[in-house]
């Protein structure tokens, strides 16, 4: 049988002679040279050579374990003369023994990491990992230890894991934002003679809200003209906050002061300024100075740093009111006056009244804006503001007239105010009611003496141009002279409509194909007005159900109220 022992060769051997790997030996080998040893398999004859008598195997080349860690070879023992196998062919392995010839290498040449400022000591920042190509199962060639070369005392690294942690409390982004750390990985467990590799880690402190906003001054001075209109900007304040992003966002509020009703503040998020605007008009003659207490506060507060607070600051804003020559002021924002229609020219409609608010108290002159009174219905007394009519007015033409009245200072025509004046024209019953439409009635021919139906021939209604008080209720009737008309009657429905009914049947087109029925309509005014309207009633051929078949005047009119 084969006699085996371990076959190995040290990698990277560079001696002058081939290195002995081991010896093939059979226990039937008597040493007479009758046995011939044959080597085959991976690297046989090139890397590994055998002395076929002694069975000694030598490595002829330098081997690299990191390239190939083992070789599988086949051993044979045969009779030197007959080549007859003396042992069964057998596989064996030659192992390449490791030496520490590879340094540790980091996965990345540089790393980038973030950690919030003011993080607690020991906060994990990032894990860096190195690898070593040497054999981890043999010796310490691949046993790595991490250490920090640059970056102390701010950061530390765990020797076994490569986890970088914060090492200093209260690191402040506002003082230093970026750190450059160098980490070393060394093999041989970190001992002398070990190989090493390094990597650079750039660590950025991210912002937290650890700074309150601060006004750079304790008082702001501003001024506003009394002529300024609400919404107009008065001035700006700005609190500085060294934090960035949403941690640095500031919002402004007025928290106190005698100007709280007259001024407001909004936040300009582009510039992070507080914009003070006029909320209500100010009057130099009434009050000449205002004071505001303005607060700047962070929008987003971090609960962890609440004890650093308060995250707000206040400042005093003093606003002085500047005098302006103001236009006259009407005593009312608008006026409503009434006048009866048909009133004689020169009738007084009403009065407007304005005053100069300035200390000078200049006299006022009034005028009508002629663009608003193109028909010149009205005049105004320039000195006292009384408005009068120039002609009778017709409510049915215009029920409301809207004019604009100007008031100007006598010494400065540019200082002018205007006011809308609405004039309601009151109704007088000066229109009689009329048919609401050009009604036409149709009645069926019949040889029956009774009316064919108790339905109205047509239902009529009326229109009156006057106001409702002088319009409905409308009363419909036949004129007194034909009240007992044998053919038709009018029944007032008491809802501003009336039905026209046939009093008999037996209408014949040959006898008479058209009837003209006068109808009196009077309105509900005091005194009432009335008109006589003529209803045309045509006699038509109908079917037994009362539906039209034909009329002599075929161009009959369809009405919503039509019924036959």
């Amino acid at each position: 049988g084969w006699v085996w022992n371990q076959f190995f060769v040290i990698e990277e051997y560079t001696g002058p002679d081939p290195v002995l790997v081991g010896r093939l030996h059979s226990d039937i080998d008597s040493g007479d040279g009758n046995i011939k040893y044959i080597l085959s398999g991976e690297g046989a004859g090139t890397i590994f050579v055998i002395d076929d008598k002694s069975g000694n195997i030598h490595a002829t080349k330098t081997l690299d374990r990191e390239e190939r860690a083992q070789y599988t070879l086949m051993a044979q023992a045969v009779d030197r003369d007959t080549n007859r196998p003396l042992e069964p062919p057998s596989e064996f392995i030659v192992k390449v023994q490791d030496i520490n010839d590879n340094p540790p290498e980091f996965l990345h040449e540089t790393y980038h990491a973030n950690v919030p400022e003011r993080s607690n000591v020991g906060t994990s920042v990032i894990q860096v990992t190195a690898s070593d190509a040497d054999d981890p199962t043999y010796g310490n060639s691949a046993k790595l230890v991490y250490s920090i070369l640059e970056g102390q005392p701010y950061f530390s690294v765990e020797a076994q894991t490569g986890i970088i942690r914060t090492a200093l409390p209260n690191m402040d982004r506002e003082a230093k934002e970026e750190y450059h750390v160098v980490i070393q990985a060394k093999d041989m467990g970190g001992h002398m003679g070990g190989l090493s590799g390094t990597t650079k880690v750039t660590i950025t402190l991210t912002d937290v809200n650890d700074n309150p906003p601060k006004f750079p001054q304790s008082v702001y001075q501003m001024s506003v003209s009394e002529a300024a209109v609400p919404g107009e900007e008065v001035g700006r304040v700005k609190a500085k906050d060294p934090d960035i992003g949403e941690n640095g966002l500031v919002t402004y509020n007025i928290v106190d002061g005698d100007g709280m009703e007259s001024f407001e503040i909004t936040t300009d998020y582009e510039t992070q300024e507080g914009v003070i605007k006029l909320k209500k008009p100010v009057d130099f003659e009434t009050k000449r100075a205002y004071s505001l207490k303005v607060e700047a506060a962070n929008v987003h507060i971090d609960p962890k740093f609440i004890s650093n607070g308060p995250f707000k600051d206040t400042v005093t804003v003093k606003i002085s009111v500047e005098d302006a020559d103001e236009p006259p002021m009407f005593l009312a924002p608008s006026y409503i006056h009434e006048v009866q229609e048909n009133a004689a020219a020169g009738t007084v409609v009403g009065r407007v009244h304005a005053k100069d608010p300035d200390a000078a108290n200049s006299p006022i002159r009034y005028s009508i804006d002629r663009h608003t009174d193109l028909d010149r219905f009205f005049t105004i007394n320039p000195e006292d503001g009384f408005i009068k009519t120039t002609k009778p007015l017709d409510r049915e033409e215009t029920a409301w007239l809207n004019i604009t009245v100007f008031a100007a200072e006598i010494h400065n025509r540019h200082q002018e105010a205007k006011v809308p004046v609405a004039i309601r024209v009151l109704d007088v019953n000066d229109n009689a009611p009329k048919f609401a439409a050009p009604y036409e009635g149709f009645i069926c021919e019949s040889d029956q003496t009774k009316p064919l139906s108790n339905q109205p021939i047509v239902t009529i209604s009326a229109d009156d141009k006057d106001d409702t008080a002088n319009g409905p209720r409308f009363i419909f009737s036949l004129p007194p002279e034909i009240i007992h008309n044998p053919n038709f009657t009018v029944r007032d429905n008491r809802d501003n409509t009336a039905g026209v009914y046939a009093r008999r049947g037996g209408f014949s087109r040959q006898k008479q194909d058209l009837y003209l029925l006068p109808i009196v309509i009077s309105d509900g005014g005091i005194p009432p007005m009335s008109s006589t309207n003529t209803l045309t009633i045509k006699v038509c051929g109908c079917d037994v159900n009362g539906a039209l078949l034909s009329c002599n005047a075929e161009a009959y009119i369809l009405n919503a109220g039509l019924s036959t």
């Epitope: 029956q448 139906s453 339905q455 109908c542 079917d543 037994v544 159900n545 009362g546 539906a547 039209l548 078949l549 369809l558 009405n559 919503a560 039509l562 019924s563």
Partner: antibody
Framework: EFQLQQSGPELVKPGASVKISCKAS????????MNWVKQSNGKSLEWIGA????????SYNQKFKGKATLTVDQSSSTAYMQLNSLTSEDSAVYYC????????????WGTGTTVTVSS | QIVVTQSPAIMSASLGERVTMTCTAS???????LHWYQQKPGSSPKLWIY???NLASGVPARFSGSGSGTSYSLTISSMEAEDVATYYC?????????FGGGAKLEIK
């Protein structure tokens, strides 16, 4: 409840005549005109004509003049329609229907009588 | 005579869907004389809507009618299974009275 009860189905030969009846109940027969409507198999409705039960006056659709004759018997509150010279075109369901005079709509319909003309 | 045309002749609708059918007259018809009838297979027609927009007794409020002149319509705000039927439009403005060809309503 207003009802119009019509006579039963009729199977008649071409050229013959048929008289179908419509008995009214639940209302005053003479207050409403009676109308007749034809519905051919699966088709729409066609007005045949109408009769005033008070006077016996009638109106016919031009298409049915000479084909249909409408009569009433006030004593039994019954309306009749006679169809003559029957052809296969006259096979249909025939309805009597009451007319509401004011707006002229058919507010009550009979049960329908099926007439089949076949040799 | 006045010719009455209904469209569509057949229509399918899902339950809960809004349904509208139209009726067109060849000449102007007073709204007082435009009516609608419902007919189910094997039954007589029933008055459904009279004078354009008035619901006959017992007709559900989901039905409505509108129109004027030559154009009229019947609408069901939310289709229900019991609404499956044929609907006929009818004018009696002028004699002879005429009916539309019918609109058959089915469930989708």
């Amino acid at each position: 409840e207003f009802q119009l009860q019509q006579s039963g189905p009729e199977l008649v030969k071409p050229g013959a005549s048929v008289k179908i009846s419509c008995k009214a109940s639940g209302y005053s027969f003479t207050d409403y005109n009676m109308n007749w409507v034809k519905q051919s198999n699966g088709k729409s409705l066609e007005w045949i004509g109408a009769i005033n039960p008070n006077y016996g006056t009638t109106s016919y659709n031009q298409k049915f003049k000479g084909k249909a004759t409408l009569t009433v018997d006030q004593s039994s509150s019954t309306a009749y329609m006679q169809l003559n010279s029957l052809t296969s075109e006259d096979s249909a369901v025939y309805y009597c229907t009451r007319l509401y005079y004011g707006s002229r709509y058919f507010d009550v319909w009979g049960t329908g009588t099926t007439v089949t003309v076949s040799s | 005579q006045i010719v009455v045309t209904q469209s569509p002749a057949i229509m399918s609708a899902s339950l809960g869907e809004r349904v509208t059918m139209t009726c067109t007259a060849s000449s102007s018809v007073s709204s007082s004389y435009l009516h609608w009838y419902q007919q189910k297979p094997g039954s007589s027609p029933k008055l459904w809507i009279y004078s354009t927009s008035n619901l006959a007794s017992g007709v559900p409020a989901r039905f409505s009618g509108s129109g004027s002149g030559t154009s009229y319509s019947l609408t069901i705000s939310s289709m229900e299974a019991e609404d499956v039927a044929t609907y006929y439009c009818h004018q009696y403005h002028r004699s002879p009275p005429t009916f539309g060809g019918g609109a058959k309503l089915e469930i989708k």
